[in-house]
Interface confidence: medium
C-alpha cells in the first residue's frame, strides 16, 4: 500500500506516536540561522581586528623575542641593538671595515700573480717553477674566489721590475720559497681565477643607444619593492657589486631583489638576497666608499645572458681619454624625465681628476678614490636610477673600474659623472668575500 | 692609551648581590660595546652580556636573564655590571671587555678582571 | 647555538718547535673567528681575528688560518712567554659570543 504522502507516519513505522510537524523556514531561521550569522560575523569581525591589529604592529612595530616586547619598527637596522638577541639588526646592510692587505694580487701584465712578503713589505713576481693547481687555488681563496683557477706560463718581459721568486704554500697563504734560485723556466705565473668579463656580443661606438643584454651580461637591476632603484654588476656566482648609497633610504635586506638577464627592466624573475655590506661610513669624506657587495641567496647560474665581469687588475692606472663604457635604465632627461624601460648604453672617457676638482667642476671633492668620466662637450652621461651600475673598460676581457656614484646634474660639460675607483677597493671586497667564503 | 680599569675584589654572602664597575678611557666611551665575561677558578670563559654605552641598550645570555644588569654612566665613562641572588658558583673572575661594534668585531681590549668570590 | 670546540685540551711542546692549535665550529662561521692568548692572573689577549688577521703588536710567528668550521693557530718558534692558555671565539652578525673550552699550551 503506498502511503499517504502527507500523512504524519514515518514510512517505517507501526503504531508509534506521530512526529511534530516541522517548524516553518522562517521560525528555524529566528532560533538557528540568526545565532549562526551572529557567531559568523562576530568571528569575522575578531578575524578583521586580529589581522588588522597585525597589519598595523607590523606596519609600525617589531617583535623581539626573549623577552617578548616590541620595538619601533623605525629602531629596525638604526645600527642600534634595541633586542636583546639583536634581531633588529640581523637582516639589515652589515658594515666591514677595510681590513688588512691581501697577500696576493694581479697584474694588468698578463694577469701574472705576485705575492707579497710580510716581514719586508716588498712585492715579488710568481717564477712558475713548481707552480701546481693547489697553489693556484690557495692564490684564489686568498682573493676570496671559491671557483676552480686556472694558469699559464707567460714569459717574463724586458721591463719586468719586480723580483721574481718561486712559491710554496704554508698555513694556506703563498710565501716565497726560502732556498728560492734563480727563475729556471723565465716563465711568471699568469693567474685567472674565475672566467669572466666575456659577451657574446662587442657594442658599438656611438652617443647613447639601446643596449642589448647580450653585450652586458653581468648588468642587473637591483629593486627594492619591486621598484627598480639602483644598477649593479655580477661578479662571481654569489656577489653583485653595487653603490653604498643605494641602500641609505632602505637597510633591512628582505625587500631587496635582484634582477638579472634581460635588458628589459620588468621581464626578469627577482633573486632573493642573503647579505649587504658595505665599508663603515666616513663622515669626513662623505661621499667615499661609495661601494656595496650584496651576496645572493642561492647562486646563479651562468648563461649567454649571466655572467660575471672582472674586477680590475691592481695596477689598472686609465689614462685621461681612455674609452670606457656605461650602462643603466636611469633618468633619460635630467629633471622630470623617466626612467628607461630599455637598457641603454653609451661610451664616455676618462676625464683627468686634476680637470675634474678645478674650481668650475668639484672644486677638490673628488677624492683619489674616485674617478671621472664623461665627454668633454657633455651631454653624455649616467643619470639618478644608473647608481651603482658599472663602469667597464675592454682589454682583453670587460673589466669594471668604477661604480656609478655622484654628480651634479647629468651630463653638464664641467661636471662629469663621479664614480668610485675599485682597484681602491680590491683588498676590502678580497676581505669580505673571504670572510663569508 | 686605551684602558680599561675594573674595581676590586669582592667578597659575598649568598643570596646578595655584587655590582663591578669598568672605567674606560683612552676612547670615545660611546662608540665602543662593552661586554662581560666571567672564568671561575681553572675554567674557560664564559660570555655574560653586552650594553651599548650610547643608547643604554642591553642584552644578556640567556643563562643570566633575570639576575645580572648592566647600566653605564656617560660622565664618568664607567660602565656597571650588577649580579644578582649570588650563588657559590657565581665565584668567578669577572671581565670587562670592548668591541668596536657589536658587528663582526672580537674584544680587542679587556679590563685587568674582577675577582668576586662567594661564601657564606 | 653554535658551539665551538678546541683540541687538544693540552699541547706539550718544546720550546723553538712549532705548535698547532685546532679549533671546529658546530656549524659555518664564515672567518668570524677571533684567537685569544691568556697567561695567569692576567686578562685575555686579542691574538687573531677574521681568522687569519693579526690584531696590533701581534708577533709574526702567531698565524692563524681556516674558514667555515675548521680553524687552526700556529705558533711557528714558541717562545718562553708562548705557554699560556688560548681560546678562539666565533664572533658574527648576532651579539651573542661564543668561546670554545680553551687549550693549554705548556713546556715539554
Known amino acids: 500500500m503506498l502511503q499517504d504522502p502527507d500523512s504524519d507516519q514515518p514510512l517505517n513505522s507501526l503504531d508509534v506516536k506521530p512526529l511534530r510537524k516541522p517548524r516553518i523556514p522562517m521560525e528555524t531561521f529566528r532560533k538557528v540561522g540568526i545565532p549562526i550569522i551572529i557567531a559568523l560575523l562576530s568571528l569575522a569581525s575578531i578575524i578583521i581586528v586580529v589581522v588588522l591589529i597585525k597589519v598595523i604592529l607590523d606596519k609600525y612595530y617589531f617583535l623581539c623575542g626573549q623577552p617578548l616586547h616590541f620595538i619601533p619598527r623605525k629602531q629596525l637596522c638604526d645600527g642600534e641593538l634595541d633586542c636583546p638577541l639583536g634581531e633588529d639588526e640581523e637582516h639589515c646592510v652589515k658594515s666591514f671595515p677595510e681590513g688588512p692587505a691581501v697577500a696576493v694580487r694581479l697584474s694588468k701584465d698578463r694577469s701574472t700573480l705576485q705575492v707579497l712578503d710580510s716581514a719586508t713589505g716588498n712585492w715579488f713576481s710568481a717564477c712558475f717553477d713548481n707552480f701546481t693547481e693547489a697553489l693556484a687555488e690557495t692564490a684564489c681563496r686568498q682573493m676570496g674566489y671559491s671557483s676552480k683557477p686556472t694558469f699559464r706560463a707567460v714569459e717574463i718581459g724586458p721591463d719586468q721590475d719586480l723580483d721574481v721568486v718561486e712559491i710554496t704554500e704554508n698555513s694556506q697563504e703563498l710565501r716565497m720559497r726560502n732556498s728560492s734560485g734563480p727563475c729556471l723556466s723565465g716563465s711568471l705565473v699568469s693567474l685567472h681565477c674565475l672566467a669572466c668579463g666575456k659577451s657574446l656580443k662587442t657594442p658599438r661606438v656611438v652617443g647613447v643607444e639601446e643596449a642589448s643584454v647580450d653585450s652586458w651580461p653581468w648588468q642587473v637591476s637591483i629593486q627594492y619593492d619591486k621598484q627598480h632603484v639602483c644598477g649593479g654588476s655580477i661578479l662571481d656566482p654569489h656577489w653583485v657589486l653595487t653603490a653604498a648609497h643605494c641602500f641609505r633610504k632602505h637597510t633591512d635586506v628582505f625587500n631587496w631583489k635582484v634582477r638579472a638577464g634581460s635588458d628589459k627592466l620588468g621581464s626578469f624573475p627577482s633573486l632573493a638576497v642573503a647579505k649587504i655590506i658595505i665599508i663603515e661610513f666616513n663622515p669626513m669624506y662623505p661621499k667615499d666608499n661609495d661601494i656595496a657587495l650584496m651576496k645572493l641567496q642561492f647562486p646563479l647560474t651562468f648563461s649567454g645572458t649571466v655572467r660575471p665581469i672582472c674586477l680590475p687588475f691592481f695596477d689598472e692606472e686609465l689614462t685621461p681619454a681612455t674609452p670606457l663604457w656605461i650602462i643603466g635604465w636611469g633618468f633619460t632627461k635630467q629633471n622630470g624625465g623617466k626612467m628607461s624601460d630599455i637598457l641603454l648604453q653609451a661610451s664616455v672617457q676618462v676625464i683627468d681628476s686634476t680637470r675634474c676638482n678645478a674650481d668650475d667642476a668639484y672644486q677638490g671633492e673628488v677624492t683619489e678614490k674616485m674617478m671621472c668620466a664623461g665627454i668633454p662637450e657633455g651631454g653624455v652621461d649616467t643619470c639618478q636610477g644608473d647608481s651603482g651600475g658599472p663602469l667597464m673598460y675592454q682589454s682583453d676581457q670587460w673589466h669594471v673600474v668604477g661604480i656609478v656614484s655622484w654628480g651634479y646634474g647629468c651630463g653638464g660639460p664641467s661636471t662629469p659623472g663621479v664614480y668610485t675607483k675599485v682597484s681602491a677597493y680590491l683588498n676590502w671586497i678580497y676581505n669580505v668575500w673571504k670572510a663569508e667564503l | 692609551q686605551v684602558q680599561l680599569v675594573q674595581s676590586g675584589a669582592e667578597v659575598k654572602k649568598p643570596g646578595a648581590s655584587v655590582k663591578v664597575s669598568c672605567k674606560a678611557s683612552?676612547?670615545?666611551?660611546?662608540?665602543?660595546?662593552m661586554h662581560w665575561v666571567r672564568q671561575a677558578p681553572g675554567q674557560g670563559l664564559e660570555w655574560m652580556g653586552w650594553?651599548?654605552?650610547?643608547?643604554?641598550?642591553?642584552g644578556y645570555a640567556q643563562k643570566f636573564q633575570g639576575r645580572v644588569t648592566m647600566t653605564r654612566d656617560t660622565s664618568t665613562s664607567t660602565v656597571y655590571m650588577e649580579l644578582s641572588s649570588l650563588r657559590s658558583e657565581d665565584t668567578a673572575v669577572y671581565y670587562c671587555?670592548?668591541?668596536?661594534?657589536?658587528?663582526?668585531?672580537?674584544?680587542?681590549?679587556w679590563g685587568q678582571g674582577t675577582l668576586v668570590t662567594v661564601s657564606s | 647555538e653554535i658551539v665551538m670546540t678546541q683540541s687538544p685540551a693540552t699541547l706539550s711542546v718544546s720550546p723553538g718547535e712549532r705548535a698547532t692549535l685546532s679549533c671546529r665550529a658546530s656549524?659555518?662561521?664564515?672567518?668570524?673567528l677571533a684567537w685569544y692568548q691568556q697567561k695567569p692572573g692576567q686578562a685575555p689577549r686579542l691574538l687573531i681575528y677574521?681568522?687569519?688577521t693579526r690584531a696590533t703588536g701581534i708577533p709574526a710567528r702567531f698565524s692563524g688560518s681556516g674558514s667555515g668550521t675548521e680553524f687552526t693557530l700556529t705558533i711557528s718558534s714558541l717562545q718562553s712567554e708562548d705557554f699560556a692558555v688560548y681560546y678562539c671565539?666565533?664572533?658574527?652578525?648576532?651579539?651573542?659570543?661564543?668561546f670554545g673550552q680553551g687549550t693549554k699550551l705548556e713546556i715539554k
Open positions: 656549524q659555518s662561521v664564515g672567518r668570524y
Open positions: 671565539q666565533h664572533y658574527d652578525s648576532s651579539p651573542m659570543y661564543t
Open positions: 683612552g676612547y670615545t666611551f660611546t662608540t665602543y660595546y
Open positions: 671587555a670592548r668591541a668596536r661594534t657589536w658587528l663582526l668585531s672580537p674584544f680587542d681590549y
Open positions: 677574521g681568522a687569519s
Open positions: 650594553m651599548n654605552p650610547n643608547s643604554g641598550n642591553t
